[in-house]
């Protein structure tokens, strides 16, 4: 698995160089996560037809996996940095159940799905600090997630290779349209 | 055990009708998707006509859409396939299918868990 941002070389190596604002420190980190979604994918498209054949294969998806919606205020139209930091923030906590779910499910990729799982841990805690409405998050029930979990394990093996294959898109479109929104904070 | 029974198959003329049923046995479908497909003698087993266990949402392959209508009596525990129009490309044997968990739909046989023993549908020109 890559390095985790900050943990390279050259960090170590110059230590003159001016320490990383908190917005630099998510955009990295987001980048990072995306870079380990990629090599995921990667596996899951090598070891399966998923990825050209979903659309044609898929008649009705109840993932409820996250999504940017106009209401959110992440898009250029209707911006609200508020909301769509609540919104960005609220939506990776309801992503972990899903992360969760990818670990076990790769093989030469296990470390690396380890990592985007706990990179994405850390995303969370930077952004919570940076929010200023953090009563208005509200954190996924652990007996929902715990069934939800359940379930997404107890399909057979081909809905087991869609679902990973519409989490890691629908994780990849995600975080795109998060990194595009908290660039322009 | 899990069980699914199919039957109303037959002999039919071209244009007429056949309403298959499905019973399933040894748990309960209501959330789970279940669906028709059918395999022509030579052919590959094809995806017919699927119904959504949470939504009710139908779904037809092209080549039955306006003819064939897919219903589920949860109650019964039951799928109907009503076949009107019948042509004699429809001759196969059709197999009801169910999957257990329900957070996916699709029309692709690998995508579900249980499997009736066939009907066969013969039409005769």
């Known amino acids: 698995a890559p390095v985790p941002p900050g943990e390279d070389s050259k960090d170590v190596a110059a230590p003159h160089r001016q320490p990383l604002t908190s917005s630099e420190r998510i955009d990295k980190q987001i980048r990072y996560i995306l870079d380990g979604i990629s090599a995921l994918r990667k596996e899951t498209c090598n070891k399966s037809n998923m990825c050209e054949s979903s659309k044609e294969a898929l008649a009705e998806n109840n993932l409820n996996l996250p999504k940017m919606a106009e209401k959110d205020g992440c898009f250029q139209s209707g911006f609200n940095e508020e909301t769509c930091l609540v919104k960005i923030i609220t939506g990776l906590l309801e992503f972990e159940v899903y992360l969760e779910y990818l670990q076990n499910r790769f093989e030469s990729s296990e470390e690396q799905a380890r990592a985007v799982q706990m990179s994405t841990k850390v995303l969370i805690q930077f952004l919570q600090k940076k929010a200023k409405n953090l009563d208005a998050i509200t954190t996924p029930d652990p007996t929902t997630n715990a069934s939800l979990l359940t379930k997404l394990q107890a399909q057979n093996q081909w809905l087991q290779d869609m679902t990973t294959h519409l989490i890691l898109r629908s994780f990849k479109e995600f975080l795109q349209s998060s990194l595009r929104a908290l660039r322009q904070m | 055990a899990v069980q699914l029974v199919d039957s109303g198959g037959g002999l039919v003329q071209a244009g007429g009708s056949l309403r298959l049923s499905c019973a399933a046995s040894g748990r309960t479908f209501s959330s789970s998707p279940m669906g028709w497909f059918r395999q022509a003698p030579g052919k590959e087993r094809e995806f017919v006509a699927a119904i959504s266990g949470r939504s009710g949402n139908t779904y037809y392959a092209d080549s039955v859409k306006g003819r064939f209508t897919i219903s589920r009596d949860n109650a019964k525990n039951t799928v109907y396939l009503q076949m009107n129009s019948l042509k004699p490309e429809d001759t196969a044997v059709y197999y009801c299918?169910?999957?257990?968990?329900?957070?996916?739909?699709?029309?692709?046989?690998?995508?579900?868990?249980?499997w009736g023993q066939g009907t066969q549908v013969t039409v005769s020109s």
């Open positions: 299918a169910a999957e257990r968990v329900g957070l996916l739909l699709t029309v692709v046989a690998e995508g579900y868990d249980y």
